[in-house]
C-alpha cells in the first residue's frame, strides 16, 4: 500500500535529481560542441564574436569554489532561457543561410528546452524560491546581413558552449557537496 492519503510524497533524492540534470547538461554540451565544429567548418570566421544581447558569462576563474546551488540554478536557468531565445531567433532569421545546420539547430533547441524544464523541476523539488516570470525581452533585431547572422551564430554557440561548460563544472562540484 502507498502512503496514506494526504501525506506528502517522499521527495526524490536530491543527488539523483541533480545527477540527471548534470547528465542532460553534459549531453547538451556535446551537442553544442559538435554544432560549433560544424559551424566553424562550413562558415569559418576568425576571431572572437560578440552579441550584446547575450548574457555575460556567469563566472570568473576563482568563483567555482564559492558556488551555492540556488544561485547556480537560478543563474543557469536565466542564461539558458536567453540562449533558447537566441537560438529560436537564429533559426527564424537565418533559415535559408543556415539550412545545412538546420536539423542540428532544431535538435539543440529541443534539448535546451528539455534542460530548462529539468532545471525548473529541480528547483521546485529542492524548494528553491520560484522566480517571477521574466519581463518580455525586447525583440532581437534581424541581422544586418548574412555575414552578420553567421557571426551571430558563432557568438551564440560559443557563448552557449562556455555557459554549459561552466554549468557542468559547477553542478559536478555541488553534487559532491550534497
Amino acid at each position: 500500500p502507498g502512503p496514506p492519503p494526504g501525506s506528502p510524497r517522499a521527495s526524490p533524492d536530491p543527488r539523483a535529481e541533480l545527477d540527471s540534470t548534470v547528465l542532460l547538461t553534459r549531453s547538451l554540451l556535446e551537442d553544442t560542441r559538435q554544432l560549433t565544429i560544424q559551424l566553424k567548418d562550413k562558415f569559418p570566421a576568425d576571431g572572437d564574436h560578440n552579441l550584446d544581447s547575450l548574457p555575460t558569462l556567469a563566472m570568473s576563474a576563482g568563483a567555482l569554489g564559492a558556488l551555492q546551488l540556488p544561485s547556480v540554478l537560478t543563474r543557469l536557468r536565466a542564461d539558458l532561457l536567453s540562449y533558447l531565445r537566441h537560438v529560436q531567433w537564429l533559426r527564424r532569421a537565418m533559415g535559408s543561410s543556415l539550412k545545412t545546420l538546420e536539423p542540428e539547430l532544431g535538435t539543440l533547441q529541443t534539448r535546451l528546452d528539455r534542460l530548462l524544464r529539468r532545471l525548473q523541476l529541480l528547483m521546485s523539488r529542492l524548494a528553491l524560491p520560484q522566480l517571477p516570470p521574466d519581463p518580455p525581452a525586447p525583440p532581437l533585431a534581424p541581422p544586418s546581413s548574412t555575414w552578420g547572422g553567421i557571426r551571430a551564430a558563432h557568438a551564440i554557440l560559443g557563448g552557449l558552449h562556455l555557459t554549459l561548460d561552466w554549468a557542468v563544472r559547477g553542478l559536478l562540484l555541488l553534487k559532491t557537496r550534497l
Epitope: R26, S27, L29, M59, A61, L64, L162, D165, L172
Partner: antibody, heavy 119, light 111 residues
Framework: EVQLVQSGAEVKKPGASVKISCKAS????????MDWVKQAPGQRLEWIGD????????IYNQKFTGRATLTVDKSASTAYMELSSLRSEDTAVYYC????????????WGQGTTVTVSS | DIVLTQSPASLALSPGERATLSCRAS??????????IHWYQQKPGQAPRLLIY???NLESGVPARFSGSGSGTDFTLTISSLEEEDFATYYC?????????FGQGTKLEIK
Amino acid sequence: EVQLVQSGAEVKKPGASVKISCKASGYTFTDYNMDWVKQAPGQRLEWIGDINPTIGAPIYNQKFTGRATLTVDKSASTAYMELSSLRSEDTAVYYCARGELAHWYFDVWGQGTTVTVSS
Amino acid sequence: DIVLTQSPASLALSPGERATLSCRASKSVSTEGYSYIHWYQQKPGQAPRLLIYLASNLESGVPARFSGSGSGTDFTLTISSLEEEDFATYYCQHSRDLPPTFGQGTKLEIK
C-alpha cells in the same frame, strides 16, 4: 600535428613547490579543456583536475584541492600545473592531457614530466 | 568515488591469440545514451594512448583489432589477434562523475 609538450624533469625538496608547463600546438587551444593526471610508481593513474582555457575555471579532484593550482596563458597556448607543499608521495610522472567535459576522455597526452621529491 | 577494478592483473599470451581484458565499476557508469568508460594503452616510458572511448568507439588511428563492449558496471576490451606491439599495460577510465578515476591496469605480456 596535434601535440602537447611538457617542461623537463624537476627535483625538489619536501615543502617546496613545482610548476609544470604544457605547450599545446596543432589545434585551437581554447576549443578543448586541459586535464592533469598523476602517475606515481606502482600506482594507478590519478586525475588531478581540469581547466577551461577560455574562462580559466579549474575543477579539482578533492584529494588535490588546496595544493594543486591549474592556470593557463591563452596567448601562449600553454597550461600550467603548480603543486605546493611537496612531500615524498608526490614523486611521480605528471601528464597534461586534452579533454572536454561532455564525455571527459583524454585523446592527446603530453610526454610527461617527472617530479622527484627528496631531501 | 567510483572504483574501477581490472582483471586479470596480468595476462601472458602469444602473438595471434585473442586477449580479453575486463573492467568492473563499483557503480553503474552508464546512462541513457552513453557508457562513460574509456580504454588506454601505455608502454614503458611513454604516455597513455586513447584506444576506445565511450565503451565501444574506436579512436581514430587505432587498429580495428581493438574493440570495446559492455554497459552498466561490466566492460571488456578485446584484441582479436595480438600483434607484437600490443604487449603493454591497459587502463580503463570512467567519466561518469567527479572525479574521473582509472583502473589499476592489466599488464599484457608475451608468453
